[in-house]
């Protein structure tokens, strides 16, 4: 569900603080049955 | 103290375009993502769009409901980070936060799509 | 996408008693740095959202400790040890580690 350019080195701020991660994963879809 | 000062919303017929800004102060912008998230009666509050450092490329985020109709970008010089709408629905209707992540929020500024 | 779900829908309480509000991921937020990217926001009406707790229990400055933030894996709490009248409002539960980030559904927070 993302589309994302470049890296994720996240080098300055402080993602614990933000409440995100410092490369989000993507969430797993489980395909309709 | 940090604020964050959105603005450009206000009323558009669907398939139009719209820009919105985000002004930051009290921090040091370069060095945070930022992002954008809507909220609306319908669906609550959802993120939209992430941008993250120059030293990330710049590398940025959407939901899959808005790819390749927005675009998320910033300008560190003027502390300021944008989201260009274009071919806009009456479902991207809604309030427009700017935030560093879920730490800190502007006031918001509202969209409505309709014909 | 994560899907977060939010319980109970509203709370009506008396200034005083005690509050918890359960959030509930459909996949695991331990994130493979070990931490847990699990928020809790408030949003009083008319006003933009104000984080409380991130990381699942670390209160943001200001924030009065009867608030208390637990909880691992896929299931949080949300805890406030005597309302007061300022508590009033929509809290929300928001995962940051996997993309896209998701909001809880909200719980309304009201005194009677």
């Known amino acids: 569900s993302e589309t994302t350019t470049g890296t994720s080195s996240n080098s300055s701020q402080s993602t614990s603080n933000s409440g995100l991660a410092p490369n989000p994963t993507n969430a797993t879809t489980k395909a309709a049955g | 103290e940090v604020r964050l000062e959105e603005s450009g919303g206000g009323f558009v017929q669907p398939g139009g375009s719209m820009k919105l800004s985000c002004v930051a102060s009290?921090?040091?912008?370069?060095?945070?993502?930022m992002n954008w998230v809507r909220q609306s009666l319908e669906r609550g509050l959802a993120w939209v769009a992430q941008i993250q450092l120059k030293s990330d490329n710049y590398a940025t985020r959407y939901v899959e409901s808005v790819k390749g109709r927005f675009t998320i970008s910033r300008d560190d010089s003027k502390s300021t980070v944008y989201l260009q709408m274009n071919n806009l629905r009456p479902e991207d209707t809604g309030i427009y936060y700017c935030t560093t992540g879920t730490d800190y929020w502007g006031q918001g500024t509202t969209l409505t799509v309709s014909s | 996408d994560v899907v977060m779900t939010q319980t109970p829908l509203t709370l009506s309480l008396t200034i005083g008693q005690p509050a918890s509000i359960s959030c509930k991921s459909s996949?695991?937020?331990?994130?493979?740095?070990?931490?847990?990217?699990l928020n809790w926001l408030l949003q009083r009406p008319g006003q933009s959202p104000k984080r409380l707790i991130y990381l699942v229990s670390n209160m943001d400055s200001g924030v009065p400790d009867r608030f208390t933030g637990s909880g691992s894996g896929t299931d949080f709490t949300l805890k406030i040890s005597r309302v007061e009248a300022e508590d009033l409002g929509i809290y929300y539960c928001?995962?940051?580690?996997?993309?896209?980030?998701?909001f809880g559904g909200g719980t309304k927070l009201e005194i009677k």
């Open positions: 928001v995962q940051g580690t996997h993309f896209p980030y998701t």
């Open positions: 009290g921090l040091t912008f370069p060095n945070h993502w």
């Open positions: 996949q695991s937020l331990l994130y493979s740095d070990g931490k847990t990217y």
